[in-house]
Interface confidence: low
């Protein structure tokens, strides 16, 4: 099948999760092909490494595309120290990386 660029979404942690003392920020990539995609996390423009996990779905039976979720996990205290959370996605269907972001407290 032909190259399909991912649709990218970012989700802040829920209030319920924050009450438990942790914060998970999720970057979701939907309906892309081929499977190779790269997600980089930036917090206040600083590149993060080692504190994220990725999960890729198998090919969708209808259109042979993939989806991927990358979860950045922080303590509530660390999460509240910073303002801008961003995931940067690179994929061969994108002419340049796509960045989705939010400002903590404004979403």
């Amino acid at each position: 099948r032909t190259v399909a660029a991912p649709s990218v979404f970012i989700f802040p942690p829920s209030d319920e999760q924050l009450k438990s003392g942790t914060a998970s920020v999720v970057c979701l990539l939907n309906n892309f092909y081929p499977r190779e995609a790269k997600v980089q996390w930036k917090v206040d423009n600083a590149l993060q490494s080692g504190n994220s996990q990725e999960s890729v779905t198998e090919q969708d039976s209808k259109d042979s595309t993939y989806s991927l979720s990358s979860t950045l996990t922080l303590s509530k205290a660390d999460y509240e120290k910073h303002k801008v959370y961003a995931c940067e996605v690179t994929h061969q269907g994108l002419s340049s990386p796509v960045t989705k972001s939010f400002n903590r407290g404004e979403c």
Partner: nanobody
Amino acid sequence: QVQLQESGGGLVQAGGSLRLSCAASGRTFRNYAMAWFRQAPGKEREFVAVIRRGGGDTYYSDSAEGRFTISRDNAKNTVYLQMNNLKPEDTAVYYCAADVSDDNTGKYDYWGQGTQVTVSS
């Protein structure tokens, strides 16, 4: 309509270099993103590198990073791929492609015919 014509392929020994060119005609060249893809025998076409409109941002595949350099000359309507430290696994037909969408979304509407690169060990 955009026409793309690649050149510069050939046979080179491992460790050598080649410079591919892709000449474009038909639209305002500086306004669209240009990419290189390649296809090895029996394999899918894969992304190599892209340079965004104007000539600023570039992005490379993991296999091209550090060895290949994409550049463009808007005055000559040409995009280049400088390939250094070539390996046998770089053997493929190399294609240039143009994304003419306003937001450079990665929809490569126009493709060249390709140029063969063969790297011998």
